[in-house]
Amino acid sequence: GSERTCCPVNWVEHERSCYWFSRSGKAWADADNYCRLEDAHLVVVTSWEEQKFVQHHIGPVNTWMGLHDQNGPWKWVDGTDYETGFKNWRPEQPDDWYGHGLGGGEDCAHFTDDGRWNDDVCQRPYRWVCETELDKASQEPPLL
């Protein structure tokens, strides 16, 4: 019979993807690098169903996702089209707010305490979620 592929140890499988949920915070760029070192990427939310899954696992905590507009337009880190894709912004967001006093606006997207999205200063140390496709994750032995 065919051997079932599975996610690495400590990752959660859902709908042919593997997810890893941090329990500590990093700036967006450092969270992005962390996922890349795992041959993964910051989570890309493509449906309401995936939104609910992630929201269930992170709880009411600010958490980075793989969406940013550091180079102008909003972009998902895996190339998923932003304009036509799923969105779940809070009302009046994104607003690229400059009033925080930290310099610049707000270029990185995160899940807020109610799961809806907000743009914020990319240097804030929020938790994050990594995602990789199940087929990719299973090409090598799981991390033990």
Epitope: K26, N33, R36, L37, E140, P141
Partner: antibody, heavy 123, light 107 residues
Framework: EVQLLESGGGLVQSGGSLRLSCEAS????????MNWVRQVPGKGLEWVSA????????FYADSVKGRFTISRDNSKNTLYLQMNSLRAEDTAVYFC????????????????WGQGTTVTVSS | DIQMTQSPSSLSASVGDRVTITCRAS??????VGWYQQKPGKAPERLIY???SLQRGVPSRFSGSGSGTEFTLTISSLQPEDFARYYC?????????FGGGTKVEIK
């Protein structure tokens, strides 16, 4: 026992190229990110480059970006560093170092190092 | 890049002394710090990971503490084999950066 054995160092002219290799044993090589770190004789340590478990992502220090390329062959348990356009300031001992992921800490570290291979760039 | 400022750069101590080495990070790096010992002509060996966890096989006279921006490596009772160079490494943010090193010499 985890072991890392570097090779490929030597004397090269400025502008020349070298390819370093690091053969790994004693652990599941394909399950770990890997690094190159260098040390100018008598000086401190400088991280050079890292590569993810499957090689899909690579990272470089600004000082070597565009000149050095890190790669790996998981079927051979071997890490590589292709060094082009070498400069006198690249003269150093180059260490291969195993990455370590501690997910409880969301922490990447470097836990085991090879003995190093010496690269000398003459101008 | 995050700067790791290590002090002192060298120190002289006697067998049995308590030795403390400090690394200061230029920004908050949580506890993403390791401490390494390097003897002449040898590769570095990790003593401490995640700021305060002792590497398996490392004597308990070595300990690490700190979080945020200030980190300390302590050798509670210096032994002859401890005379070496010590480095801290931050791995919170890319690129990883080392402290400048501390040479522990015999007084």
């Amino acid at each position: 026992e985890v072991q890392l054995l570097e090779s490929g160092g030597g004397l090269v002219q400025s502008g020349g190229s070298l390819r370093l290799s690091c053969e790994a044993s004693g652990f599941i090589f394909s399950s770990y990110a890997m690094n190159w770190v260098r040390q100018v004789p008598g000086k401190g340590l400088e991280w050079v480059s890292a590569i993810s478990r499957r090689g899909g992502s690579t990272f470089y220090a600004d000082s070597v970006k565009g000149r050095f390329t890190i790669s790996r062959d998981n079927s051979k348990n071997t890490l590589y560093l292709q060094m082009n356009s070498l400069r006198a300031e690249d003269t150093a001992v180059y260490f291969c170092a195993k990455g370590e992921l501690l997910e409880d800490y969301s922490y990447y570290g470097i836990d085991v190092w090879g003995q190093g291979t010496t690269v000398t760039v003459s101008s | 890049d995050i700067q790791m400022t290590q002090s002192p750069s060298s120190l002289s101590a006697s067998v049995g002394d308590r030795v403390t080495i400090t690394c200061r990070a230029s920004q908050d790096i949580r506890n993403d710090v390791g401490w390494y010992q390097q003897k002449p002509g040898k590769a570095p060996e990790r003593l401490i990971y995640a700021a305060s966890s002792l590497q398996r096989g490392v004597p308990s006279r070595f300990s690490g503490s700190g979080s945020g921006t200030e980190f300390t490596l302590t050798i509670s009772s210096l032994q002859p084999e401890d005379f070496a160079r010590y480095y801290c490494l931050q791995h919170y943010s890319y690129p990883p950066t080392f402290g400048g090193g501390t040479k522990v010499e015999i007084k």
